[in-house]
């Protein structure tokens, strides 16, 4: 009896440029004789429905059709047919199929590979063309993938114990695609410093599929003027 097991949930998520291991475990009723086994990995792109061979292993032959692709013969002895792909790129996302043939038995499994890129975030103060006591803060998020991203602005005044989401005077621009396939976006907050309490902390909060916790960049209103804080992307303590 031959069985193949892939990543639970059927999806693997990996960061862009990572050396990814796509899991495939073989379960066989007898000890695995790799000389009598054939392992083939296939890839189907998200954009077109054609399956392409990525790697094959049988007997003493192994061939990578994607540069750097490898299945470890040592691990294969213990039933681990996982495929290692160094420097994974965005366009390599899609469906990967692990096909195993041992003697007269065959089994296969598929997994979806998602490649994500985490945004970098920075705060900029733009006072050009602004009125007296008015400032524009720009929160730039760059190099992220996929395109879906959520940018919000929050403030916490001196007196209140928790942040408050700001919806007025916020404009988030369109996402712009970079040459490498990643995206950039800028969100702007317009502030009238004369109407705000000194000591109020503002932060731009970026939420994206690639992030376990939101990316935060903050600044504090000082009595004199707004000051960008020393530490952008601070942790949120509570």
């Amino acid at each position: 009896d031959l069985k193949v097991e892939m990543m639970a949930g059927g999806t693997q998520i990996t960061p862009l440029n990572d050396n990814v291991t796509i899991f495939c475990n073989i379960f066989y009723s007898q000890p695995l004789n790799i000389a009598a086994a054939a392992i083939t990995w296939f890839w189907k792109s998200l954009t077109f429905d054609k399956e392409v061979k990525v790697f094959e292993f049988f007997g003493d032959h192994q061939e990578a059709f994607r540069p750097g692709a490898i299945v470890s013969p040592w691990r294969l002895k213990s039933g681990d047919a996982s495929l290692r792909l160094p420097g994974i790129q965005l366009e390599e996302a899609g469906e990967y199929r692990c096909e195993v043939v041992v003697a007269a038995a065959a089994a296969q499994g598929t997994v979806q590979l998602e490649v994500v890129a985490s945004p970098a975030s920075r705060l900029l103060l733009d006072q050009v063309g602004m009125k007296e006591n008015e400032d524009k803060y720009m929160c730039e998020s760059s190099g992220f993938y996929p395109e879906a991203i959520n940018i919000t602005w929050e403030k916490q005044t001196q007196k209140f114990p928790h942040p408050i989401e700001i919806s007025e005077d916020v404009i988030t621009g369109p996402t712009i695609k970079n040459m490498d396939g990643t995206f950039n976006v800028t969100s702007c907050l317009k502030l009238n410093s004369s109407q705000e309490d000194p000591g109020t902390v503002y932060q731009c909060v970026v939420r994206h599929a690639s992030l376990h916790t939101p990316l935060r960049s903050n600044f504090t209103l000082t009595a004199a003027r707004h000051s960008l804080s020393e530490t952008e992307k601070t942790d949120n303590f509570s």
Partner: antibody, heavy 117, light 107 residues
């Protein structure tokens, strides 16, 4: 990291007064507002009042006006709450809480006040 | 004063279950609601702010929802350490007010 130090427990007689302290460290003390909360077993939490830590502003829950007085000693980064004319109903855990330099609130470990004859 | 009502003082659940703690405000508080967890002998710890935003470090099994007057804290895949007390708090205006608390206990 913000830390708020409070004495663990205080025992006082009915009718007496008591001063509870809350010493802050790990952030710019005078920039912020300090709240005080009361918690009696099984009765949830109540906001007593708050004080701006440069000492120039206080705010009280109507229910605690005349009962609680908040003061601050900036030199020792300590906030005080004086409770007067104590009764058994004043037996509770009292917490100080502040925003600190980042988002979210920080709580002291609380002082258990026991009013008993 | 704004009254925050947590109608259930106790709720029974099992490890691995999903449980929802509810809170009702006596008037519209927008999204200005926080949820606290308090373990015995400890001070309260904020989990959620703005009704649905998790503080960093809070496990994603904790989810807040609601706006206006009705709010919910949902815990999916309840862990043994989650079996404790939860409070809601409004912070749209002073005096800050809290719900009376809901204690999660083992079924």
């Amino acid at each position: 990291q913000v830390q708020l130090q409070q004495p663990g427990s205080v025992l006082v007689r009915p009718g007496a007064s008591v001063r509870l302290s809350c010493k802050a460290s790990g952030y710019t003390f005078t920039n912020y507002w300090m709240n005080w909360m009361k918690q009696r077993p099984g009765q949830g939490l109540e906001w007593i009042g708050g004080i701006y830590l440069n000492g120039d502003s206080t705010d009280y829950n109507e229910k605690f006006k005349g009962k609680a007085t908040l003061t601050v000693d900036t030199s020792s980064s300590t906030t005080y709450m004086d409770l007067s004319s104590l009764t058994y109903e004043d037996s509770a855990v009292y917490y100080c809480t502040t925003r600190g330099d980042y988002f979210g609130d920080f709580w002291g470990q609380g002082t258990t006040l026991t009013v008993s004859s | 004063d704004i009254v925050m009502t947590q109608s259930q003082k106790f709720m029974s659940t099992s490890v691995g279950d999903r449980v929802s703690v509810t809170c009702k405000a006596s008037q519209n508080v927008g999204k200005y609601v926080a949820w606290y967890q308090q373990k015995p002998g400890q001070s309260p710890k904020a989990l959620i702010y703005s009704a649905s935003n998790r503080y960093d470090g809070v496990p994603d099994r904790f989810t807040g929802s609601g706006s206006g007057t009705d709010f919910t804290l949902t815990i999916t895949n309840v862990q043994s350490e989650d079996l404790t007390e939860y409070f809601c708090q409004q912070y749209i205006s002073y005096p800050l007010t809290f719900g009376a608390g809901t204690k999660l206990e083992l079924k």
